[in-house]
């Protein structure tokens, strides 16, 4: 028998520095977690103690903090090289700055293979990107070899900016021939490493003949065997065992997100490459694990540029940006409109001639808007200003909801109106009218939504049975502020870009902004 240790991360999302327990900015260092310096300490400890170790990343290193905003992926290549990752799969967020924003900072600089079997380049891009990412990689480990085959969510064109010269194929269809090639080469230990979410990970384990282990990402799935060490609630045991169609037991793993945990899986193979046993657990990277001094020093060196960036002007406002709780928790506020407009603008993807865009609607809890921005400071807007407005380090995500769920969400928005509570929704691509004289749960008297399958966008009444795409904060997607109906009834959820980054990019693009209060939210006569 031959034993392999797989160390894995996924959805790190630019958390190069240690974070608080909820993966936001570290405040009290003695209680902070994760970060590449601490990760390196643990990885090195395991490498020294065990003979056959692979360190893998399942995608979405890009996007999530000011580190990515400023360094645009160069930080990912630098620190992943320093940690000596063995392989990485491409995630959807790796395309956030377009293909060039992937090629130059990461693909050309990474000293480890970057993988995806289901992304095919065409046209002029084919020769430019050739060899910079691979469908699979054969890695020597000790006296054996391990094949690693990569995959990426086929929804990436809707979630990011891969352009028109990359085709995202069905994962299973694309993986099988590559696994077959590895088998042809007598590589009999094969890991599928990818970024399509836990459901797809399980399907790959079930359907792709020859895959021995699946290491996934995208869905931020936390798996754990025994008592979990922090706040995350396990979605199942670690590893999650799937019985394949040809009768093999295939371990599937994921390690939550944000570099909070290091996935740790031990696999025992027989001489024919069959998995005999698998066990392990994610390792919580808490403050009991010291930060490696050399990596920490490097982080501090790179950090300097971030501090300078946060005070630079992104653009100007010529109007007061009303982000006060007195406005945003009671009525339409122009800060809410600005943020929602930025959220939609960030999700412009012309992937189908029938649709002007795949999504037109935004909802945003008023309680998530934490500060106004005064235009009387020469109109200057900085990252620092936006960090005061959106201090929680969240993301603006894409969900699919039925009309009936949206109606419930808008009823919840005003179910206890008048108490300055955070659930009051700011909107984009939606016209809502409330009648507060009616009883809670029946206050939405008009709800019109902007069409997507149209050449001239216009507002149509919400259809209860129709499925709509909506951009919203991850806080709402996870049921925050009492929006349990969103969490319970959503049909799909894909995590998006860092909230501040979305707004800062929009302001930089527009240069000068002047959002108005324009009648997106109305109250019927006599009730307000």
């Amino acid at each position: 028998a031959w034993e392999l240790t797989i160390l894995h991360t996924n959805d790190v999302h630019s958390r190069l520095e240690q974070t608080s327990e909820d993966s936001s900015k570290c405040v009290n260092a003695s209680r902070c977690m994760g970060g590449v310096a601490r990760l390196f300490t643990k990885v090195q400890q395991i490498r020294r103690a065990e003979p056959n170790v692979l360190l893998l990343d399942a995608g979405d290193q890009y996007q999530g903090t000011i580190w990515f905003t400023v360094y645009k992926g160069a930080e990912v290549a630098h620190f992943m090289n320093a940690l000596r990752y063995d392989a990485m799969a491409l995630g959807n967020h790796e395309f956030d700055n377009g293909v060039e924003g992937l090629i130059e900072p990461l693909l050309k600089e990474a000293k480890f293979p970057i993988l995806s079997a289901n992304i095919k380049a065409k046209g002029p891009l084919a020769s430019q990107i050739s060899g910079l990412y691979l469908p699979y990689k054969v890695l020597p480990v000790g006296d054996e070899v391990v094949g690693i085959v990569g995959y990426t969510s086929k929804e990436t064109p809707f979630l990011s900016n891969p352009g028109t010269n990359l085709v995202f194929e069905d994962e299973i269809t694309a993986l099988q021939p590559e696994v077959d090639k590895l088998k042809t080469l007598n590589v009999n230990k094969i890991i599928a490493l990818g970024h399509s979410g836990f459901e797809m990970d399980k399907l790959i384990a079930q359907k792709v003949r020859g895959v021995d282990v699946v290491v996934g990402g995208h869905s931020n799935t936390f798996l754990y065997t025994g008592n979990p060490p922090s706040k995350e609630v396990p979605a199942g045991k670690y590893p999650f065992i799937v019985t394949s169609d040809d009768g093999r037991k295939v371990p599937v793993v994921q390690a939550y997100a944000f570099g909070k945990y290091l996935g740790y899986l031990k696999i025992e193979f027989d001489e024919r490459g069959n998995v005999i046993s698998s066990h392990g657990n994610p390792i919580l990277l808490n403050s009991s694990i010291p930060e490696d001094p050399s990596i920490k020093a490097d982080i501090n060196k790179w950090r300097i540029k971030l501090d300078n960036y946060s005070t630079q002007e992104l653009g100007k406002t010529i109007v007061y940006l009303d982000g006060s709780s007195q406005s945003c928790r009671f009525r339409e506020c122009n800060m809410g409109n600005l943020i929602c407009d930025a959220m939609i603008n960030n999700n412009l993807r012309h992937t189908d001639e029938m649709f002007w865009n795949h999504v037109s609607m935004c909802i945003l809890n008023g309680g998530g808007i934490r500060s106004p921005i005064d235009e009387r400071n020469n109109g200057t807007i900085t990252w620092e200003n936006l960090a005061a407005v959106l201090p929680f380090g969240g993301t603006f995500d894409l969900v699919q909801l039925k009309g009936s769920t949206l109606k419930k969400a808008f009823e919840h928005s005003v179910h206890r109106y008048g108490q300055s509570t955070g659930e009051f929704l700011q909107v984009g691509g939606i016209h809502v009218v409330y009648d507060l004289s009616r009883k809670p749960g029946d206050r939405v008297v008009k709800l019109d939504v902007l069409c997507t399958k149209c050449r001239v966008p216009s507002y149509d009444p919400l259809k209860m049975d129709e499925v709509y795409k909506v951009i919203l904060p991850n806080f709402l997607a996870n049921g925050g502020d009492g929006f349990q109906m969103i969490k319970d009834e959503l049909l799909r959820h894909d995590s998006g870009d860092q909230d501040i980054n979305v707004v800062s990019t929009y302001i930089s693009k527009m240069k000068v902004i002047y959002p108005a209060v324009e009648g997106r939210i109305k109250f019927s006569t006599g009730s307000h």
């Epitope: 000293k111 480890f112 060899g131 990689k137 090639k181 080469l185 007598n186």
Partner: antibody, heavy 118, light 107 residues
Framework: QGQMQQSGAELVKPGTSVKLSCKTS????????ISWLKQRPRQSLEWIAW????????NYNQKFTDKAQVTVDTSSSTAYMQLSSLTSEDSAIYYC???????????WGQGTTLTVSS | DIVMTQSHKFMSTSVGDRVSITCKAS??????VVWYQQKPGQSPKLLIY???SRHTGVPDRFTGSGSGTDFTLTLTNVQSEDLADYFC?????????FGGGTNLEIK
Amino acid sequence: QGQMQQSGAELVKPGTSVKLSCKTSGFTFSSSYISWLKQRPRQSLEWIAWIYAGTGNTNYNQKFTDKAQVTVDTSSSTAYMQLSSLTSEDSAIYYCARHVNWDYFDYWGQGTTLTVSS
Amino acid sequence: DIVMTQSHKFMSTSVGDRVSITCKASQDVGTAVVWYQQKPGQSPKLLIYWASSRHTGVPDRFTGSGSGTDFTLTLTNVQSEDLADYFCQQYRSYPWTFGGGTNLEIK
């Protein structure tokens, strides 16, 4: 675009050793396999061995296990092959070639001509 | 060891013609076959891998086919610059082995 620059022609005496070098650029050395191949005049190619630059793992054609030793220096992105106990049968052009997996050679050096003669 | 046999050491063709170079493996190699072109005084150059996948930048007049034991490299609309030796190689099992080569001459 990747390049592999091999050391110059060698004229050596039988029974001695020689170390050939192959300096690479334009691709990620640490995640590449470097193979060495032999081509006698007007003949086909023979694969000698590969080395995985990232780890130093090697795999040899059994025919050459006592003849060749392959190494890498990652700091200079250079691969080396030492040939020992040379005879006239070792006179050939030796190529280094890059492959990212256990498959095709996508970049080749220009070749080093080795002549073993007394 | 797997023996790769290129039965024609020499082949003659004219500009604009179509020519097929064959390669036979002594045992099943699946599609783990690659074709190289070597011009006089130069290093080999990759043309086809996995029996039929054309390498980036290789003109589409070069086509590979076959699986198992029989493989073919087909050149359509032959050009004068195609004068070269053509080698097949298997990477199904160690040691990797090459065919003896086919020298294509242009009449």
